[in-house]
Structures are given as structure tokens and as C-alpha cells.
């Protein structure tokens, strides 16, 4: 069978080889398509309800005024010339429709390096057969499930026209220190060969590099956190980040009801002040970051100063914030 590719909505003429150029003709066309069950026979004398879909022209050719999805299938003509010689023509018809130019919707203007980000959703409407969508980074194809690339695809079919809508959502994890303005595009490749791909306009999101968080340092004075009863302990929270974050204090994992401050002074230490202290720095961009915990303990006169005392009472005693 001869393969014929026809665009949906366009006319199509199939020649009946060996047919006399004008009536009288001995020929018949047989169709096996989405409109038929088994074979439908059309003859030159026909003329009827099928004319809107396919009719035999005076020269014996079969004329389809506007090809549709249901016209995909086999078309056969059997003709006899004036000398009684029989000729058969056999066609396999496939139809296609090129969609509109694909578009990237819901596109991100900024991506964060090191974490997965949704880049956007590529949409193609009105294709047949369905075809495929693919993503490109700086002109090179992106391979799903490689190097932090993932793609979620969806295909829908219009209930009346039978044409396809494709959607493809791209997620990427940009590498730290990579291109600060990558160029993403999406292209539609038709399901039938010999038709070029359609590409979207590119998008160029910025890649934001989160500054690596330097540790929050907690400095204790006296060193080791062991102090005689009635002594003073000074805790200083050192955060390299700019602008300076807000500092809150914790004792035994519970926030202390104090205004934010980078320094915590514990004057006239008593048993109730013993415990594990830490500070929490809250950055507007990164969220909270906690320091290591230090133990504050009381040493009775004559004891060696331990580097870490045991956790004592729950009272707050007298606190001073510098």
C-alpha cells in the first residue's frame, strides 16, 4: 500500500489507477477507516450521505473535502479499463495536525541552587498524533532523571476534535557555582516524521546562590562554664552573618523569655542557674540556626573546675542581658 499523509481539515484526492478518465467507468472504491466497520463501497453512481466525507469524482479519483481523524485507514480502488484489464490501487492514509507554537507557562523567575525548583510548565495544544515535548538547557536536550532533572508529563484528548494537549512540568536542581542565568526552552516534536520541531521562546531565570551558613559560635566566660556560687557567667553568641540576625536564648531546650540579645549574663550564680544553654540566630533569609550547647555548673570551694557540669535546678535566678 502507498502511504499517504494528509493534514486534518485539508482536501485529499486519491487517484484510481487504470480508470478511464471519464464515465462510463467500471470501478469501485472500498474504504476501511474509523468511519466504517469492515469495508464501505463507494461507486461513481453513488452520491449520497457519504459525499460530505468522500465522493468519487468524474475521473474516478476519490475526493475527501476535509480529512479528519476518522479518515485514517485503508482506501482501495479496483478499476477496469476499456479493454477489460483490471488495476488495483491501495492507499494507507494517516492524518496529522500541527499544534500551535508551544508555550512555557507558570515559569519561575528565580531558582535556588542546590535544591529542586519548578522551572515551568510547557504546553502544546491541538496536535495529532500526540507527539512529544522535550526540554533544553542552553540549547542542549535535558534528560529526565539525570543530574537533578525531573519531568512530569500529562496528555489530554479533546472529546470533540480528538486533538491532543500535552503538558510537561520541568523540575531542576541547579548546581552551586553554576550558570547564574541558564536558558531553558521546550520543543514539540510531531508524532509523524518529516515535520520539524516547534520551539518555545526561551526563559532565563536567575539562579540564587544561598550563602553557606557559617556556624553560630557560643563563647562562655569563664571557659568551661564552671563557676563558684555567687559568681558571674557571660555567654556571647557570635554570628558572622550580615546583617546581624536576632539572637534568642535557650536553657535545657526551652526558650528563655528574654528580649533578643547577642550576650547573656548570669550574675550571682545559684543552683537554679545550672543547665545547658544555647543560642538561636534567626536570619530573615535562612530561618533559625542553633549554636552548640554548653553546660553551666557550680563548683563548691575546693573542687576542680570541670569542663562540663551536671544539669541542676530549674530556676532562672537573676539574669542580665548586655
Amino acid at each position: 500500500a502507498q502511504n499517504i499523509t494528509a493534514r486534518i481539515g485539508e482536501p485529499l484526492v486519491l487517484k484510481c489507477k487504470g480508470a478511464p478518465k471519464k464515465p462510463p467507468q467500471r470501478l469501485e472504491w472500498k474504504l476501511n477507516t474509523g468511519r466504517t466497520e469492515a469495508w464501505k463501497v463507494l461507486s461513481p453512481q453513488g452520491g449520497g450521505p457519504w459525499d460530505s466525507v468522500a465522493r468519487v469524482l468524474p475521473n474516478g479519483s476519490l475526493f475527501l473535502p476535509a480529512v479528519g481523524i476518522q479518515d485514517e485507514g485503508i482506501f482501495r480502488c479496483q478499476a477496469m479499463n476499456r479493454n477489460g484489464k483490471e488495476t488495483k490501487s491501495n492507499y494507507r492514509v494517516r492524518v496529522y495536525q500541527i499544534p500551535g507554537k508551544p508555550e512555557i507557562v507558570d515559569s519561575a523567575s528565580e531558582l535556588t541552587a542546590g535544591v529542586p525548583n519548578k522551572v515551568g510548565t510547557c504546553v502544546s495544544e491541538g496536535s495529532y498524533p500526540a507527539g512529544t515535548l522535550s526540554w533544553h538547557l542552553d540549547g542542549k536536550p535535558l534528560v529526565p532523571n539525570e543530574k537533578g532533572v525531573s519531568v512530569k508529563e500529562q496528555t489530554r484528548r479533546h472529546p470533540e476534535t480528538g486533538l491532543f494537549t500535552l503538558q510537561s512540568e520541568l523540575m531542576v536542581t541547579p548546581a552551586r557555582g553554576g550558570d547564574p542565568r541558564p536558558t531553558f526552552s521546550c520543543s514539540f516534536s510531531p508524532g509523524l516524521p518529516r515535520h520539524r520541531a516547534l520551539r518555545t521562546a526561551p526563559i532565563q531565570p536567575r539562579v540564587w546562590e544561598p550563602v553557606p551558613l557559617e556556624e553560630v559560635q557560643l563563647v562562655v566566660e569563664p571557659e568551661g562554664g564552671a563557676v563558684a556560687p555567687g559568681g558571674t557567667v557571660t555567654l556571647t553568641c557570635e554570628v558572622p552573618a550580615q546583617p546581624s540576625p536576632q539572637i534568642h536564648w535557650m536553657k535545657d531546650g526551652v526558650p528563655l523569655p528574654l528580649p533578643p540579645s547577642p550576650v547573656l549574663i548570669l550574675p550571682e550564680i545559684g543552683p537554679q542557674d545550672q543547665g545547658t544553654y544555647s543560642c538561636v540566630a534567626t536570619h530573615s533569609s535562612h530561618g533559625p540556626q542553633e549554636s552548640r550547647a554548653v553546660s553551666i555548673s557550680i563548683i563548691e570551694p575546693g573542687e576542680e573546675g570541670p569542663t562540663a557540669g551536671s544539669v541542676g535546678g530549674s530556676g532562672l535566678g537573676t539574669l542580665a542581658l548586655a
Partner: antibody
């Protein structure tokens, strides 16, 4: 909403002529074939004529061929049936219907107009 | 020409009954059959298109089926408004041919 409204029916002498009209609205008229169907009093439905969407091709049963002519004016969204040499057996309610080809069949119908041959 | 032989020509039934009407085509007409309902003094209304498809706005108690050249209209549970005359139509070839009609009456 698809609407088909027939007019032009009435009493006619044997051998006389009558022209029926059908005004269409609520759809793209020139996308559809159109058809006339009739129903004699107390009887079933009978196909009378069909015309393709462009108006280039017309179709009739033997019972009315050469006497009736179907036509259309796509600019006016109108369908017509010119009936000549009327006979007693042409007495019927005449319906205008959308379609007549394999893509549509007959989907929407007008309310009909009565043609009576006075013999 | 194609003949569409419709049966029965009339039937009596009660509200709630199931009803089956058949049309037999004299030759293959594919799926190209419609079913219509007509009430006295009114235009026909399409119920089923292409043998098995329910037209818009038609209650789901109506259904169409096909086996070769035999076509069936089924009303699963008759309602008072279903008492009417029903016609089949083949539109695969000219002349377009209607069945003779089936009058569904109240028992």
C-alpha cells in the same frame, strides 16, 4: 440554541406550485447539510430532499425528483423547497431538519409547515 | 433501496415497564442509524445517534444497540412522558429511509 422555523405552507391546487422556506439560527449554517422531511396525515416520516453545505449538490428520492428543488442561501441562513406539479400524495407536514450526511444524520428539526393539495 | 423494517408497529405498556423496539436494515448500513421520538402535533426529537450514542439532554433510560443489521432502541423503565411514536432512520445511503414507526401506548 439551534432553531429552525418553516414557513410557506398552505392550500394549493392540483398541479400547482408552492415555495417553502426555513429560517435557521443558533449555529453556523454553512457548515451543515440541510434536509426536508415530510409526514402525511396519520402516516410515517418520508425523506424529501437534501443539500450539501455549499449548495452545490442536491439529492432527492424518485418520488419528488424533477418536481421539487431544494436550495439554500448561506448569506441569509435560509433553506428553500420549491414544489411544482403538486399531487394529492404531496399533502403533508413538511419539516426542515439539520444534517442529512453521515457526520450528522438528522439532529435538529423545525416544527413543520402544512401543505394541503385541495383536490 | 434500503428497507428499514421496524417492529412492533405498536405496543401497550405500563409506567415502569421496560420496552424494546427493533429496526432491521435490508443491507449493511454500518453505524449510521438514528432513533427519534415524536409526540402528536410535534416535530421528531433525536434520541440516539450513530446507533448507540445518547443525544444531548436525553434521559439515560434510553439506549441504542446494534448487532449487524439489527438495531434496537430500549427504554429501561417507561415514564409517563415516554408514550409517543418512535422511528428509526438509516443515513448510510440515499434514499434516506425511516422505519414505519412504533406507537407506544398506555396499557
Amino acid at each position: 440554541e439551534v432553531q429552525l422555523v418553516e414557513s410557506g405552507g398552505g392550500l394549493v391546487q392540483p398541479g400547482g406550485s408552492l415555495r417553502l422556506s426555513c429560517a435557521a439560527s443558533g449555529f453556523t449554517f454553512n457548515n451543515y447539510w440541510m434536509t426536508w422531511v415530510r409526514q402525511a396525515p396519520g402516516k410515517g416520516l418520508e425523506w424529501v430532499a437534501s443539500i450539501d453545505n455549499s449548495g452545490d449538490n442536491t439529492y432527492y428520492p424518485d418520488s419528488v425528483k424533477d418536481r421539487f428543488t431544494i436550495s439554500r442561501d448561506n448569506a441569509k441562513n435560509s433553506l428553500y423547497l420549491q414544489m411544482n406539479s403538486l399531487r394529492a400524495e404531496d399533502t403533508a407536514v413538511y419539516y426542515c431538519a439539520r444534517g442529512g450526511d453521515i457526520t450528522t444524520g438528522l439532529d435538529y428539526w423545525g416544527q413543520g409547515t402544512l401543505v394541503t393539495e385541495s383536490s | 433501496d434500503i428497507q428499514m423494517t421496524q417492529s412492533p408497529s405498536s405496543l401497550s405498556a405500563s409506567v415502569g415497564d421496560g420496552v424494546t423496539i427493533t429496526c432491521q436494515a435490508s443491507q449493511d448500513v454500518g453505524i449510521y442509524v438514528n432513533w427519534f421520538q415524536q409526540k402528536p402535533g410535534k416535530a421528531p426529537r433525536r434520541l440516539i445517534y450513530r446507533a448507540t450514542n445518547l443525544a444531548d439532554g436525553v434521559p439515560s433510560r434510553f439506549s441504542g444497540s446494534r448487532s449487524g443489521t439489527d438495531f434496537t432502541l430500549t427504554i429501561s423503565s417507561l415514564q409517563p412522558e415516554d408514550f409517543a411514536t418512535y422511528y428509526c432512520l438509516e443515513f448510510d445511503e440515499h434514499p434516506l429511509t425511516f422505519g414505519g414507526g412504533t406507537k407506544v401506548e398506555i396499557k
